[in-house]
Interface confidence: low
């Protein structure tokens, strides 16, 4: 139909710059390139109705719905959202197309729904329908990858059942220990699901999507390496696949590998072997033990034996539910102002935990390091000698764990004073918590040595500032001290600090700080 205008509907995603929430018909913002929403005529609709592709928006994201109208003459418009009419101000671009925009700032649930745009041109009237919904990230998942043997091939497939579909990559390293860290030059990454080169020292598979990145290491026993002092341990949940690789290198091919579970040979179909010659003509053999879906009775000691190497074992423990084992009793530490110190938590967990360290409602990234004995450790050193409560929180799919730490910094008290018509108060945050004395300064005692004991009320640790205790002392005013200077002193094992206060003086109270080491 020649009378119908040429319409283009686009979505513009904005980089949020913390603008306030609101709707507007034209709004300049930093933006990404527009995405065509392909406005199509809606069939069998009364009147001319165009329908844009559905728009999914992240919570708090900012977007612009925009319509470009290639029609002669002026246009007028009206937006309707949830039965409310919204102002509409069309303008024209350089190609003389009518441009109508709806800006949604910081997307919320209330801003989701159908946006109708009614446009009236000199030739015709038409309606454009946009459906905007919040992207349901609750449905997003990122699952740890697992391995499967490729049908009829000596290769492993890496699978991560995640939403949105993750990017899967193999992370390979042929060095030992530290040099196999993620960004090391010894590490090779292959962005593919299938891996044929299974002879490497360290093989991991990682999956990543909008929720982050999860990795699984191929559990390996290397018969040419000295065994750990404690037996390596592998935890799995019922139903998960078990994969253990046994690797051995020998001067020639005259050796074989076997797997046993609890002194009993593994059944046919639960293992497969591969071998290759290395560059120096030595023979490398690997033997995989695998169970596609473990049950509790797959728990036990898996031993890899060779006719030319000492055998080595691993303990496989199948659990019904994930766990986090650690002592959750709170711990208190007292350190000097410049003493080096780190909090640490030692734990055993399966599946791997996600963790945070929190101080004063601020979260800090949490690093974990595996120890040789099957335990892991997380340390936090970035306390910047700030006293207070520090919280370690860890969780995995099945368990949660929280541990509290208190850090006290040994230091001399610092005194702050305030006064009212009826009393004077002093506050101090030193540690150990200080004791208080009040002294009266008078003609008889110009050095303020006359001690005040009446009307003094001490409160230890009466309020917490960012988890830091504050001690206070209050002196109730009496006729005997009105108009006099008084001195409050806080002292602990590291020193003394005082403030002098003029009681009942007109106007603001003058405070004189007086530090005594």
């Amino acid at each position: 139909n020649q009378d119908l205008p040429v319409i283009k509907c686009v979505l513009i995603n904005h980089k949020n710059n913390d603008s306030s929430v609101g709707k507007s018909s034209s709004y300049p913002m930093v933006s990404e390139s527009p995405e065509d929403l392909g406005c199509a005529l809606r069939p069998q609709s009364s009147g001319t109705v165009y329908e844009a592709a559905a728009v999914e928006v992240d919570v708090s994201a900012s977007i612009t719905l925009q319509v470009l109208v290639d029609a002669p003459g002026n246009i007028s418009c009206l937006w309707v959202f949830k039965h409310s009419s919204l102002n509409c101000q069309p303008h024209f671009d350089l190609q003389n197309r009518g441009v109508v925009s709806m800006v949604i700032l910081k997307m919320t649930e209330t801003q989701a729904g159908e946006y109708l745009l009614f446009i009236q041109s000199e030739a015709t009237n038409y309606t454009i329908l946009f459906t905007v919904s919040i992207r349901n990230t609750l449905l997003y998942t990122l699952r740890r990858p697992y391995f499967r043997k490729m049908e009829n091939q000596d290769a492993l497939v890496c699978i991560s059942e995640s939403v949105p579909e993750p990017i899967v990559e193999w992370v390979l390293c042929d060095s030992q220990g530290e040099s196999c860290k993620e960004e090391s030059p010894a590490v090779v990454k292959k962005e593919e699901k299938v891996l044929h080169e299974l002879f490497g020292t360290d093989i991991r598979c990682c999956a990543r999507n909008e929720l982050g990145r999860e990795c699984t290491r191929l559990f390996t026993i290397d018969l040419n390496q000295t065994p750990q002092t404690t037996l390596p341990q592998l935890f799995l949940k019922v139903g998960e696949p078990l994969w253990i690789r046994c690797k051995a290198v020998h001067v020639n091919h005259g050796f074989g590998l076997t797997w046993e579970l609890e002194n009993k040979a593994l059944e046919e179909g639960n293992y497969f072997e591969m071998s290759t010659y290395s560059t120096n003509r030595t023979m490398i053999r690997i033997l995989f033990a695998f169970v596609s879906s473990v049950a509790r009775n797959d728990t036990g000691y898996y031993t890899c034996s060779s006719s030319k190497h000492p055998s080595q074992s691993a303990l496989v423990t199948i659990v019904e539910k994930g766990f986090i084992n650690a002592t959750n009793s709170s711990e208190d530490y007292e350190i000097d102002q410049y003493e080096e110190f780190c909090f640490s938590v030692r734990f055993k967990a399966y599946p791997q935990i996600r963790c945070t360290w929190t101080f004063s409602r601020k979260s800090f990234p949490c690093e974990q390091k595996g120890l040789d004995n099957g335990y892991s450790i997380s340390k936090f050193c970035n306390h910047k000698h700030q006293p207070g409560e520090y919280i370690f929180h860890a969780e995995n799919d099945d368990a949660q764990f929280t541990k509290m730490f208190t850090l006290n910094i040994r230091r001399k008290p610092q005194v702050l004073a305030e006064a009212s018509a009826s009393q004077a108060s002093c506050f101090s945050d030193g540690y150990p918590l200080p004791s208080w004395t009040w002294k009266k300064c008078s003609d008889k005692s110009p050095n303020c040595t006359e001690e005040i004991t009446e009307g003094v009320w001490n409160r230890k640790a009466n309020r917490k500032v960012f988890g830091q205790w504050v001690s206070s002392s209050t002196l109730n005013m009496s006729e005997a001290i009105k108009g006099f200077l008084v001195k409050c002193c806080a002292y602990n094992s590291l020193g003394t600090s005082c403030e002098t206060i003029l009681l009942n003086s007109p106007g603001p109270f003058p405070f004189i700080q007086d530090n005594i080491s």
Epitope: T230, L231, A295, R296, N297, T299, T317
Partner: antibody
């Protein structure tokens, strides 16, 4: 929850046989090994043997070989331990116990006291 | 057969004490060692398996360490319910063998 319920106490004469039963519930019977361990009065624990309830295969401690027989009935989730040619030193509490793998023992029956006395 | 020797055979301690029980194997058993607690008239209860792994539901004051021939069970802060007899057991080879037990009593 996992439960291992054993048959009641027995008094036997020397030379006789005793058959102790152990009924398992609360888990998949064929998925776990079953051990038999005994404890003489005031003494320590002594391992007698193990049965795989799935296949029925057994391993016995050398000391009891020829005198002990371990069997299972998968239809009733029950294992049996029969000890023959009883002597007075066989007086003990006999425990059936579920194996975590073949190695550690994570659940135990309540025990059956077998007294051998003339 | 592998012999397991526990020491001490009996031990007196108070609530709150840190207690250590040792177990020695007559040959190397890697980490194939388990610890059990037994109270009078009751069946034993698994505390630690594979030398250092805490059995589910067991309080974290119990810990195990060691490998090869020397092993230790530690109770970090003794509670009233911990007074019992403790056994180590090797699962390196059959027959499985137990230590003779360590009786822990209230001082």
């Amino acid at each position: 929850q996992v439960q291992l319920v054993q048959s009641g106490a027995e008094v036997k004469k020397p030379g006789a046989s005793v058959k102790v039963s152990c009924k398992a519930s609360g888990y998949t019977f064929t998925s776990y090994y079953m051990h038999w361990v005994r404890q003489a009065p005031g003494q320590g624990l002594e391992w007698m043997g193990i049965i795989n309830p799935s296949s029925g295969s057994t391993t016995y401690a050398l000391k009891f070989q020829g005198r002990v027989t371990m069997t299972r009935d998968t239809s009733t989730s029950t294992v049996y331990m029969e000890l023959s040619s009883l002597r007075s030193e066989d007086t003990a509490v006999y425990y059936c116990a579920r194996g975590l793998g073949k190695s550690a023992i994570d659940y135990w029956g309540q025990g059956t006291l077998v007294t051998v006395s003339s | 057969d592998i012999q397991m020797t526990q020491s001490p055979s009996s031990l007196s301690a108070s609530v709150g004490d840190r207690v250590t029980i040792t177990c020695r194997a007559s040959q190397s058993i890697s980490s194939y060692l388990n610890w059990y607690q037994q109270k009078p008239g009751k069946a034993p209860k698994l505390l630690i398996y594979a030398a250092s792994s805490l059995q589910s539901g067991v309080p974290s004051r119990f810990s195990g360490s060691g490998s090869g021939t020397d092993f230790t069970l530690t109770i970090s802060s003794l509670q009233p319910e911990d007074f019992a007899t403790y056994y180590c057991q090797q699962s390196y080879s059959t027959p499985l063998t137990f230590g003779q037990g360590t009786r822990l009593e209230i001082k």
